[in-house]
Amino acid sequence: NQDLPVIKCVLINHKNNDSSVGKSSSYPMVSESPEDLGCALRPQSSGTVYEAAAVEVDVSASITLQVLVDAPGNISCLWVFKHSSLNCQPHFDLQNRGVVSMVILKMTETQAGEYLLFIQSEATNYTILFTVSIRNTLLYTLRRPYFRKMENQDALVCISESVPEPIVEWVLCDSQGESCKEESPAVVKKEEKVLHELFGTDIRCCARNELGRECTRLFTIDLNQTPQTTLPQLFLKVGEPLWIRCKAVHVNHGFGLTWELENKALEEGNYFEMSTYSTNRTMIRILFAFVSSVARNDTGYYTCSSSKHPSQSALVTIVEKGFINATNSSEDYEIDQYEEFCFSVRFKAYPQIRCTWTFSRKSFPCEQKGLDNGYSISKFCNHKHQPGEYIFHAENDDAQFTKMFTLNIRRKPQVLAEASASQASCFSDGYPLPSWTWKKCSDKSPNCTEEITEGVWNRKANRKVFGQWVSSSTLNMSEAIKGFLVKCCAYNSLGTSCETILLNSPGPFPFIQDN
């Protein structure tokens, strides 16, 4: 065994950057740090066989399987995949190790399987086996985190039943409103499942894995805040846990907090209290109301009261199934070419939605913002004044919602013309949709004022790609106008545009744009 070379097998995951995709070079892309695949000698195998740890790859990911051989002299090699031989070109690195690479660009099902690398060195022959499979993301889930009380401790545990196992973090903020945005300096993140510091202003728990990131905010009523005009509303599905935190600060300890549901005190075991002195020696109390698994009869007004603060309530609604409530009637807008404008959808939904805006088969990211009245709003402003059909699509675990918008841009018509042996056609996409006139230019009418009404056919057609309307007018050629110049004009409330066409015998047609 002394003759056996020292072998290292590594996996390099590449970040696809479009410029390199499709180029088959040894180093096609920006890469992550290499991952050691072990490469242990396989026992009870005929010949010397090394086996690398199994490799799981996402669909469309790009990777390099690489072997580093520390052996004297030259080496030759051959890759075999599904009984086909693949070219192998070893080279040497700065430490004089032999380097053999197999680049797999844009992983597909057909590229999954066993890759065998046969290496021949001056001293010995050996085989290295790589097993590459596609990661089954169909089994992946990312569930919204929920809270549990830690046994015998005043602490909350954050749980997200997701696959693969998510990274759980608490996102804490101690200031009000806008400054609690994710990237604000007021925000503190703790990558742990248990949280003991439960007195903060804003407490969220987030779970993230390959599918993304989901967060749940600890629903809080702050008795030191002026009562809101809109009663806060909390939706939950049957079986989910309910957590509401009531928080109050007072100059001394001489106050208590109580929770009631529909004017009945919560049962013991459905609440717990914590208190602490803040830096300025005021007393902070928090009282949690919780139900480990809600039923329909947990619906109602939950009121937190204090002897030293105005009472405040939240309406908790338990639903059997999630929902998305919004008006799905389509909406049409017309705006000027430089007018600022955003589409917006106001909706109430539970659980939180995932959404997209789509225009011309291209999807755009969708942001949603919570309003004070329990509704959320999503706006889309990035239309770049392109007329057409815009689609808002939202979904959650239980519901789907689609709303269509049409954007029309008010502008003067622009005319395009084309002609054949038998007819001349003009097209325009101005808005409002233009009307058409055709005029004949002749000795009698050098200014082209002689109107043509015979043989004219107007229509509007939907240019499907953008969902925008195009108006066209076609003039069927008659002997009376053959050989003459004709002028088609499109006009709307913003102006007129014309195009002049020479109706000669078949062949290339000269067009004279005339605005």
Epitope: N263, Y301, S305, P310, L315
Partner: nanobody
Framework: QVQLQESGGGLVQAGGSLRLSCAAS????????IDWYRQAPGKQREWVAQ???????FYADSVKGRFAISRDNAKNTVYLQMNSLKPEDTAVYYC?????WGQGTQVTVSS
């Protein structure tokens, strides 16, 4: 069906007084707290005062010492006694019980 009805609004000179009433029906009145809010023209609705079911009262800083809230459970009514009124107290006054609102009563204080 819960219904709240405000009354007692009107036009009054600065320094004068008014007493607003909020009568409730369709609800076990005595076990709930009631809030008064107001909305001045072109402004957001703002909280003014609250009376709890134990008759504890709380006030916004802008009305503390001038307004007094009380309740009569037998009549299912809450009152807002407004003294030393100022022009900036001009608004529509609403009472609220949980998610339920009255229609409002107009109070105008002239200088």
């Amino acid at each position: 069906q819960v219904q709240l009805q405000e009354s007692g609004g009107g036009l009054v000179q600065a320094g004068g007084s008014l007493r607003l009433s909020c009568a409730a029906s369709g609800v076990t009145f005595s076990i709930n707290y009631i809030d008064w809010y107001r909305q001045a023209p072109g402004k957001q609705r703002e909280w003014v005062a609250q009376i709890t079911r134990d008759s504890n009262s709380f006030y916004a800083d802008s009305v503390k010492g001038r307004f007094a809230i009380s309740r009569d459970n037998a009549k299912n009514t809450v009152y807002l006694q407004m003294n030393s009124l100022k022009p900036e107290d001009t608004a529509v006054y609403y009472c609220r019980l949980l998610s339920y609102w009255g229609q409002g009563t107009q109070v105008t204080v002239s200088s």
